[in-house]
Amino acid sequence: MKTWVKIVFGVATSAVLALLVMCIVLRPSRVHNSEENTMRALTLKDILNGTFSYKTFFPNWISGQEYLHQSADNNIVLYNIETGQSYTILSNRTMKSVNASNYGLSPDRQFVYLESDYSKLWRYSYTATYYIYDLSNGEFVRGNELPRPIQYLCWSPVGSKLAYVYQNNIYLKQRPGDPPFQITFNGRENKIFNGIPDWVYEEEMLATKYALWWSPNGKFLAYAEFNDTDIPVIAYSYYGDEQYPRTINIPYPKAGAKNPVVRIFIIDTTYPAYVGPQEVPVPAMIASSDYYFSWLTWVTDERVCLQWLKRVQNVSVLSICDFREDWQTWDCPKTQEHIEESRTGWAGGFFVSTPVFSYDAISYYKIFSDKDGYKHIHYIKDTVENAIQITSGKWEAINIFRVTQDSLFYSSNEFEEYPGRRNIYRISIGSYPPSKKCVTCHLRKERCQYYTASFSDYAKYYALVCYGPGIPISTLHDGRTDQEIKILEENKELENALKNIQLPKEEIKKLEVDEITLWYKMILPPQFDRSKKYPLLIQVYGGPCSQSVRSVFAVNWISYLASKEGMVIALVDGRGTAFQGDKLLYAVYRKLGVYEVEDQITAVRKFIEMGFIDEKRIAIWGWSYGGYVSSLALASGTGLFKCGIAVAPVSSWEYYASVYTERFMGLPTKDDNLEHYKNSTVMARAEYFRNVDYLLIHGTADDNVHFQNSAQIAKALVNAQVDFQAMWYSDQNHGLSGLSTNHLYTHMTHFLKQCFSLSD
């Protein structure tokens, strides 16, 4: 359940264009009245048309100093930073000849795959048709063409071998024109998945469409096999246009149900028929009960690192395995097993972190909780107990981008103690003193406080992508000096388009309540006057390890509600949210639906005390986990909320996916946590909806949070004879995309305006 990512960057985002000054973000006041008169408020149409969307530039690195980029006219262009030269390697004409929407250059630069007929499946997965174009002769490779549709395809890291998944089996080509070698034969729809994840692994564990990994020089190919034979199936109708609806069947393990059985295999791609795929052994302490595979990291061509997780997700084991030439097998000695255990919650943050290996090919850097309960970078040489802590403080390291011989690049929220910021740091690891430098903190301090980065080979160059709070900008930098080389994308058109728009004001501040820090973002109408009273809308996500209060740019629905409709919108990060230490994060462990709701209510009470909120006009809305929290808040019996909206809410944790739910809730069994599973449903609170206006919304083809969740809420409300409003979106999934998006936001706008007695 990762809707919060979508909510942060999609149409339903919460941040707006802002310049953060002393934590309050204010637009410069206009001097001339004539200029003020030309300003207009945002319209709902602006939002639905994506008028104020922004662009980012992530180079497709192909060496230390070269990258590919698709130009505005769809040519694929190779840029050389050192020479300053660029040339088109693939014309838009060639792209158009097969209606290609994506491409991939082989590492030997001889071939390009072109991807067309994109057909979305789940969050990351899709099928497509692939064509191979030979750059040396300017022709498509004929003979032994690839089958269609393919579920996943990738080049080897060296040369131009191809691995692909077709009908749940893995195939290998030594050269694009060669006949394929079939690696697996047991693949079967909805039963056995080779090289691609099943639904739950894709959504809740790997967060990728693939489950195969080439070794660094392409000698070996590792892959996962998922056996879903015993998993219960979720079935729902897809109405389509035919006389009879189709039934969609997905093996989907809900909390406590039978899980997929995973095995990892490695095959020598040079002589694939010699010994065939060899299974990698599972650590004994993991194999003794239900378990998950969580990630695979190649260290060298003959050393691989696997991470495993117990079904009760507080114990993770990292296992380093070596190839034994004499036996042609993979050996995972116990001495190379590293255990990571949480005594206060689950292992890791949202996922267990992955290792970044150093040049000795055995020691590595990894983010995990320190003794004070903050996630920090540690260096592991022999045992986890002897880990050397690299970063420390009452803040968190978020991501390790790259480790070179002498530097480690990472992101954190250390700077100025704002958890919702991200800056990039460089730590020297081969010199004294062990200097730490913030690469981004002072670059564009007001405009840019939330960065990510993308590094070329050996970190010779890197791109910085700033997401806000000002207009996003992407820049290219020298990896040795950190000097800015050029601007890759600065969103000039967006900047010009916003010049006559009355954007809301935005502030990020914190509330201190009973030893808990509640960070909030408040979006205020353009002519905000503290002496007046405004309707308040709370936007909530609140899921474990999420973060809503972030210093990022967005012009979206809530920006419009503040700008045009004069609402105050607030987002609050309460207990269970991320990047502020384990105490806050793990507070919700085994008790979902309690503290997240309490903290939203506490914040609303504090907002009322500020004096500018009309306490008779307060609403709450959320999507996915946020729909669950908004529903529980509305049914809290506090009388604070006049109305609220739940989009695609979870209504009972027994209905949601095992991997996600059990991580935070344990099992729904009598001897584990069944009692809280039962106590935390929305249905159990049906009676409490009597005094609020409730709008319940769901897509009927939601593969993630099944329509079942809203069906059960509706049934409970009807049985309790409680009036409510509802909207379903036929054949729409968890994202409610396309025309449904327009309908959804128009419908929710009407609902809120009616609730707040605002004229249409």
């Epitope: 260096y379 002897n386 050397i388 970063t391 420390s392 062990p434 730490k436």
Partner: nanobody
Framework: EVQLVESGGGLVQPGGSLRLSCAAS????????MGWFRQAPGKGRELVAA????????YYPDSVEGRFTISRDNAKRMVYLQMNSLRAEDTAVYYC???????????WGQGTQVTVSS
């Protein structure tokens, strides 16, 4: 938390040698950047040796390079400073220090006096 206790200081003649020891308790000392500092009367604290836990690389200022050697024994949780060819200007209180990678030295011993005099 790390507790550090120095020993081995004393009076020594110019050209002589001395070996300082630092016993670490609490968190394991090999997890930390370790160093020896000194402070002469009326002067600021200066680093004389440091040892990197990542690769056991050692660092010395020019003033002691070739004369002082820092080493560690992880099993015994000890850090040593071997001082040879001592000079009068080496007279100071010597402190053992430990620290996290990114926050430098935040744990300190009480210090041990070294006097070089004839």
């Amino acid at each position: 938390e790390v507790q550090l206790v120095e020993s081995g200081g004393g009076l020594v003649q110019p050209g002589g040698s001395l070996r300082l020891s630092c016993a670490a308790s609490g968190s394991t000392s090999n997890n930390y950047f370790m160093g020896w500092f000194r402070q002469a009367p009326g002067k600021g604290r200066e680093l004389v040796a440091a040892i990197n836990p990542l690769d056991s690389n050692t660092y010395y200022p020019d003033s002691v390079e070739g004369r002082f050697t820092i080493s560690r024994d992880n099993a015994k949780r000890m850090v040593y400073l071997q001082m040879n060819s001592l000079r009068a200007e080496d007279t100071a209180v010597y402190y053992c220090a430990a620290g996290h990678w990114d926050s430098h030295f935040n744990y300190w011993g009480q210090g041990t006096q070294v006097t070089v005099s004839s």
